[in-house]
């Protein structure tokens, strides 16, 4: 079964900078990746970036840079302008779509015990109905 993993990392040198790493584990090619914060795609989440494997990326503040790391993983750099660093308590979600085969989504956040510079362990939080688009024709 395909799976999505999410890691949230605080930069050691810049405490207001965060990076979200997401990856897709499974067969098939990815046609679109959507990154949101505050909840899953379409369920209260706010879009941060959309990445297409051939057509490029689109991003919205506070996203700073979205990029592909491999054919099945992406990273999104975020700049937290607020003094209270709300990112530390925020959920980030990544949705990998493979049209028309299916879409899969998981969420993650910075662990409370994280020291700056240490990446969160890859513990995906599956979203119920994440594979509701998994059709067979």
């Amino acid at each position: 079964t395909p799976e999505v993993w999410v890691q949230v990392q605080m930069e050691a040198t810049e405490l207001s900078s965060f990076t979200v790493h997401c990856g897709f584990l499974g067969p098939g090619s990815i046609s679109l990746v959507t990154v949101s914060w505050g909840g899953p795609d379409g369920a209260g989440g706010t879009k941060l970036a959309v990445l297409h494997p051939e057509l490029g990326t689109r991003q919205w503040a506070p996203a700073r840079q979205a990029r592909w790391e491999t054919q099945s993983s992406i990273s999104l750099a975020l700049e937290d302008s607020g003094a209270s660093s709300p990112f530390a308590n925020t959920t980030f979600c990544c949705k990998f779509a493979s049209f028309p085969e299916g879409s899969w989504e998981s969420c993650g956040s910075l662990p409370p015990s994280s020291d700056p510079g240490l990446s969160a362990p890859p513990t995906p939080v599956p979203i119920l109905r994440a594979d509701h688009h998994h059709h067979h024709h």
């Epitope: 679109l32 959507t34 795609d41 379409g42 879009k47 959309v50 297409h52 689109r58 779509a97």
Partner: nanobody, 120 residues
Framework: QVQLVESGGGSVQAGGSLRLSCAAS????????MGWFRQAPGKEREGVAH???????RYVESVKGRFTISQDHAKNTLYLQMNSLKPEDSATYYC??????????????WGQGTQVTVSS
């Protein structure tokens, strides 16, 4: 995620018409295009038509003048009126909502698809 349910597919003779409908579970304001893709066995998947958030319809060259895409915001429904159908229009048609990259509507959510068969 947005639930999309297509209807209106079927079998028709060449030159005939069909009207596809797509009911969305909720308003899709967080994406910026809504449209139709099609996939025929052994052929490349293609975007048939979509409507931007500004309401402008866009069509693939092969259906211009024959297909018309429209929306009913009150019913959260997308339509595709298909006239002068040709055998090469036979395919599974998917309703999609997505994000614009230039003139392309990249699917973020889609329905299960409805089959259109045009016989000569």
């Amino acid at each position: 995620q947005v639930q999309l349910v297509e209807s209106g597919g079927g079998s028709v003779q060449a030159g005939g018409s069909l009207r596809l409908s797509c009911a969305a579970s909720r308003y899709t304001s967080r994406t910026d295009c809504m449209g139709w893709f099609r996939q025929a066995p052994g052929k490349e998947r293609e975007g048939v038509a979509h409507i931007d958030s500004d309401g402008i319809p866009r069509y693939v060259e092969s259906v211009k003048g024959r297909f018309t895409i429209s929306q009913d915001h009150a019913k959260n429904t997308l339509y595709l009126q298909m006239n002068s159908l040709k055998p090469e229009d036979s395919a599974t048609y998917y309703c999609v909502v997505g994000f614009k990259f230039g003139d392309y509507c990249a699917p973020n959510d889609w329905g299960q698809g409805t089959q259109v068969t045009v016989s000569s």
